[in-house]
């Protein structure tokens, strides 16, 4: 059994998140993940989900009663989602930490916008992809 | 020429983001995008970058002087990144809007954590992927 399972069960107890009422009003993530089978679509969604959990864990990192559980789960997320690649994890972390209200960051972001946009669609990379996109819109 | 180019140039003027000093201290996004060639890795990073721009645009949506530019760029992002797929865009938006400080959201997130984790690595989906992962770690 992966290390995160026991620690996630601990967090469930901490948050009283095992109660049946928690499932009221649908799911946060699981329903959305069900919608997307294509790996690159899943990564788009999982990227947001993982950053949500990292933010959540950051808010609870000082609570000594669950510190070990939080650390273990974060470590296991690094293994699973970033394939234990520290550079990938660091780049991701950098992106999540940029402040959207900082004028210097805003100026840089706008300065880079055209080039970022040019790279957004897989079509930008190869002609083959462009053709398949036109066949399968959506 | 894509519609976004002219409007991005407008935003550059608005933010004085054409000045040479903007490039000081490296890039926000472009350097990171250069690091990742594999499509699924790029999507992990681009997901964060796109959510950053959407947050930025939200902060400026009431500024009539750049409203049209912002709307045009957002629309073009939808076309490029979400392949004009409204469902994909809506799911993405949902994920970016969850409040990490809301206790009910926290409880739901922890309730779903084990299942989310189980789906994080592509290896979880097929044996073939698992094999290729072991050949190409990183």
């Amino acid at each position: 059994q992966d290390p995160y399972v026991k620690e996630a069960e601990n967090l469930k107890k901490y948050f009283n998140a095992g109660h049946s009422d928690v499932a009221d009003n649908g799911t946060l993530f699981l329903g959305i993940l069900k919608n997307w089978k294509e790996e690159s679509d899943r990564k788009i969604m999982q990227s947001q989900i993982v950053s949500f959990y990292f933010k959540l864990f950051k808010n609870f990192k000082d609570d000594q009663s669950i510190q070990k559980s939080v650390e273990t789960i974060k470590e296991d997320m690094n293994v699973k989602f970033f394939n234990s690649n520290k550079k990938k994890r660091d780049d991701f972390e950098k992106l999540t930490n940029y402040s959207v209200t900082d004028l210097n960051v805003q100026r840089k972001a706008i300065h880079e916008l055209i080039q970022v946009m040019a790279e957004l669609s897989p079509a930008a990379k190869t002609g083959k992809r462009k053709r398949s996109q036109m066949l399968f819109r959506g | 020429q894509d519609p976004y180019v002219k409007e991005a140039e407008n935003l550059k003027k608005y933010f004085n983001a054409g000045h040479s000093d903007v490039a000081d201290n490296g890039t926000l996004f472009l350097g990171i995008l250069k690091n990742w060639k594999e499509e699924s890795d790029r999507k992990i990073m681009q997901s964060q970058i796109v959510s950053f721009y959407f947050k930025l645009f939200k902060n400026f949506k009431d500024d009539q002087s750049i409203q049209k530019s912002v709307e045009t760029i957002k629309e073009d992002m939808n076309v490029k990144f979400f392949n004009s797929n409204k469902k994909k865009r809506d799911d993405f938006e949902k994920l970016t809007n969850y409040s990490v400080t809301d206790l009910n959201v926290q409880r739901k997130a922890i309730h779903e954590l084990i299942q989310v984790m189980a789906e994080l690595s592509p290896a979880a989906k097929t044996g073939k992927r698992k094999r290729s992962q072991m050949l190409f770690r990183g």
Epitope: F15, N16, D63 | -
Partner: nanobody, 120 residues
Framework: QVQLVESGGGLVQAGGSLRLSCAAS????????MGWFRRAPGEEREFVAF????????YYADSVEGRFTITRDNAKNTVYLRMDSLKPEDTAVYYC?????????????WGQGTQVTVSS
């Protein structure tokens, strides 16, 4: 500021019971999350149990769940830890702690500790 003073420790045989008390002064603890931690010789401090401000929501370390019970009496400004079926590995200094938030945030206020020794 909150001052915490633990009492009730001592020497007990394996299988026996003890009740630790933690008396708070300086402020009423009714809005605090109250917890117990322990440090065994040569080990890091580990979490044992806490009770949230509502008095009904509790959380225990796996190692003590089912054997230890944490309760609070806000009128007496006191928190208790009932320890049953004690094992030699429960031997440690037990510390009472208080956190200002029910969820997240650190335990910022600590007592001096009370020694519990379980002999086999």
């Amino acid at each position: 500021q909150v001052q915490l003073v633990e009492s009730g420790g001592g020497l007990v045989q394996a299988g026996g019971s003890l009740r630790l008390s933690c008396a708070a002064s300086g402020r009423t603890i009714s809005s605090f999350r109250m917890g117990w931690f322990r440090r065994a010789p040569g080990e890091e401090r580990e979490f044992v149990a806490f009770v949230r401000s509502n008095g009904t929501s509790t959380y225990y370390a796996d190692s003590v769940e089912g054997r230890f019970t944490i309760t609070r009496d806000n009128a007496k400004n006191t928190v208790y830890l009932r320890m049953d079926s004690l094992k030699p590995e429960d031997t440690a200094v037990y510390y009472c702690a208080a956190a200002t938030r029910d969820y997240g945030g650190s335990f910022d206020y600590w007592g001096q500790g009370t020694q519990v020794t379980v002999s086999s």
